[in-house]
């Protein structure tokens, strides 16, 4: 999946199976990825794992798990709230679109969290105050999470080269430059620029991740994937002047 | 091995919506000196493992990039510290604690928010 | 939670080969330096060597240079301690730990050297 | 090498009373930028050592808060405010300063 961190950084990530997203003392988030296409090294979210720890007079432990096609508006022991203790409304789901949308608001450590299904794939954003983000006792063991460090150079896909070499070869197929087997029925390139250039009209990282899905993996559905992820920034991100961002030379690496 | 606190301390110092060091500012290379500082204490404890050799050369390639010089000065992470997670043997009658932004209004001004993402493939 | 669990122990005669392996979960094996250390009987604790996360570079005390070599394979999460040319102050519990600076230890298992 | 000399090698103490091991090194072990990577730990019978403390002072992540460590240089100090049976066992002090890596002899505690 692509990832921007808590940093800004922004990378597409081939990670498989489980992976920590955040870890720190209030909250812990899982995700679990898999191949889009048999053999592809290019992966989606299916399945999303979130764990409120308990905390104070304010929230029991609570855990919400989405999986594809099942979107629930309720944590896992069917609940909608942080349970009974006196600060309880602290945390609480909404359902905004019925299996499709979830917004978790937990107020006791000021952080929002959306959860979307597009396609057959979810999504997650977050907004969280710089000092939960930091509110980690074992940096050692809890520090390494996908949202703080990225994810290990070697599981990185560099997909604006992917979209430099495609730009370059027209519609001509990509399968050498693909980090995925063709897909069944991939779009030519100036196709996969049209549908992402309609929801995506700023040519910025969120455009280019919408390219590179289309191309690899010829699912419609990843348009609105990125589409919504960036409506997600807008809506989550306390700069207002960092919400596209652009191709530049190497950045930090987020090697975990 | 305490090479994450460095990497928190240098995002710390580099984000954020007070005043933060803009990638082409003379902070942001006192932030990565700061980094580099303490990366550098370091070693002794973390230069076996993944993280101290990732920041090292994630700082090289940063100081390269920016034009920093590995002499000046250095800045100083922001950091708060927030209640304990857990359940606390002091009990408060007041709502407060369970709403994040009216605790932290008494310590200090509007908290520092930040954002990640994950989507597509 | 973090578990080692060593295993390869057992009783040799001197100048013989042992091979221990450290089978490491609850933590990302591959990201952590990781060290072997060893207790003689009723005695105390001596490092044996440390190796990086990636195998770059391998560190060793002097009473075991040129005789043992660690190594490891981050595909199976294991760290190995193949000991050769043993001697009877060999003889002690061997124990796997994690990270550069040991913070999470294996339970240990015992070497004997002994004709 | 770096010696770590502990003392006492044999600490008898009463329930509930506090307990000081002390460790010293033959060298410093502060490093040119301030830190001092001295770590202690501890050795129930039968089981494998566990980290309490490091860099002289810092608590590892679920030991409880009547373990203490204190010192800079040469001179090093953990102390129990008030002994558990628990924490019956044998204690070590180890530096990371130097190479290579070296431990204290141990002191072994028991009830008294």
């Known amino acids: 999946p692509h990832l921007r961190t808590f940093t800004d950084r922004f990378q597409t990530c081939k990670v498989q199976g489980a992976w920590p997203l955040i870890d720190n003392n209030y909250l812990n988030v899982q995700v679990t990825n898999t191949p889009v296409l048999p053999g592809s090294a290019a992966t989606a979210t299916s399945k999303l794992t979130i764990i409120f720890k308990n905390f104070q007079e304010c929230v029991d432990q609570k855990v919400y798990q989405a999986e594809m096609d099942e979107l629930p508006a309720a944590f896992v022991d069917g609940s909608k709230n942080g349970g009974d203790k006196h600060g309880a409304n602290s945390l609480k789901i909404t359902e905004k679109v019925s299996g499709q949308h979830v917004e978790i608001q937990a107020k006791y450590i000021g952080t929002t969290i959306v959860v979307r299904q597009v396609g057959r794939y979810l999504t997650f954003a977050v907004r969280m105050p710089e000092e939960v983000v930091n509110a980690v006792e074992d940096w050692d063991s809890q520090g390494l999470y996908l949202c703080l460090r990225g994810c290990p150079l070697n599981q990185q896909i560099d997909f604006q080269a992917f979209h430099t070499n495609a730009e370059g070869t027209g519609a001509r197929r990509l399968a050498a430059a693909s980090p995925a087997p063709t897909a069944p029925e991939t779009f030519p390139y100036e196709t996969a620029v049209a549908k992402c250039k309609e929801k995506l009209p700023v040519e910025d990282l969120y455009y280019q991740a919408c390219v590179f899905d289309l191309l690899t993996t010829g699912d419609v559905n990843f348009t609105l994937a990125a589409y919504y992820a960036l409506e997600d920034v807008k809506m989550l991100h306390s700069n207002k002047d960092k919400l596209h961002l652009y191709e530049r030379t190497r950045d930090l690496p987020g090697r975990a | 091995c305490k090479i994450l606190k460095c990497n928190s301390e240098f995002w710390s110092a580099t984000s954020g919506s007070h005043a933060p060091a803009s990638d082409d500012t003379p902070e942001f290379c006192a932030a990565l000196r700061s980094y580099a500082l303490c990366t550098r204490r370091t070693a002794r404890t973390c230069r076996g493992d993944l993280a101290y050799h990732s920041a090292v050369h994630g700082i090289e390639d940063l100081m390269s990039q920016h034009n920093c010089s590995k002499d000046g000065p250095t800045s100083q992470p922001r950091l708060r510290t927030l209640p304990p997670a857990g359940d606390s043997q002091e009990r408060s009658d007041s709502p407060e604690i369970c709403h994040y932004e009216k605790s932290f209004h008494k310590h200090s001004a509007t908290p520092n928010y930040t954002h990640c993402g994950l989507f597509g493939d | 939670e973090v578990q080692l669990v060593e295993s390869g122990g057992g009783l040799v005669q001197p100048g013989g080969s042992l091979r221990l392996s450290c089978a490491a979960s609850?933590?990302?094996?591959?990201?952590?330096?990781m060290n072997w250390i060893r207790q003689a009987p009723g005695k105390g604790l001596e490092w044996i060597g440390m190796i990086y996360y990636d195998s770059s570079e391998k560190h060793y005390a002097d009473s075991v240079k040129g005789r043992f070599t660690i190594s490891r394979d981050n595909s199976k999460n294991t760290l190995y301690l193949q000991m050769n040319s043993l001697r009877a102050e060999d003889t002690a519990v061997y124990y796997c730990?994690?990270?550069?600076?040991?913070?999470?230890w294996g339970q240990g298992t015992m070497v004997t050297v002994s004709s | 090498d770096v010696v770590l000399t502990q003392s006492p090698l044999s600490l008898p103490v009463t329930l509930g009373q506090p307990a000081s091991i002390s460790c010293r090194s033959s060298q410093s072990l502060e490093t040119s930028d301030g830190d001092t990577f001295l770590e202690w730990f501890q050795q129930r019978p039968g089981q494998s050592p566990r980290l309490l403390i490091y860099e002289v002072s810092s608590r590892f992540s679920g030991v409880p808060d009547r373990f203490s460590g204190s010192g800079s240089g040469t001179d090093f100090t953990l102390k129990i405010s008030r002994v558990e049976a628990e924490d019956v066992g044998v204690y070590y002090c180890?530096?990371?300063?130097?190479?290579?890596?070296?431990f204290g002899q141990g002191t072994k505690l028991e009830i008294k």
């Open positions: 730990a994690k990270g550069t600076t040991p913070d999470y």
């Open positions: 609850g933590f990302t094996f591959s990201n952590y330096g």
């Open positions: 180890m530096q990371v300063t130097h190479d290579p890596l070296t």
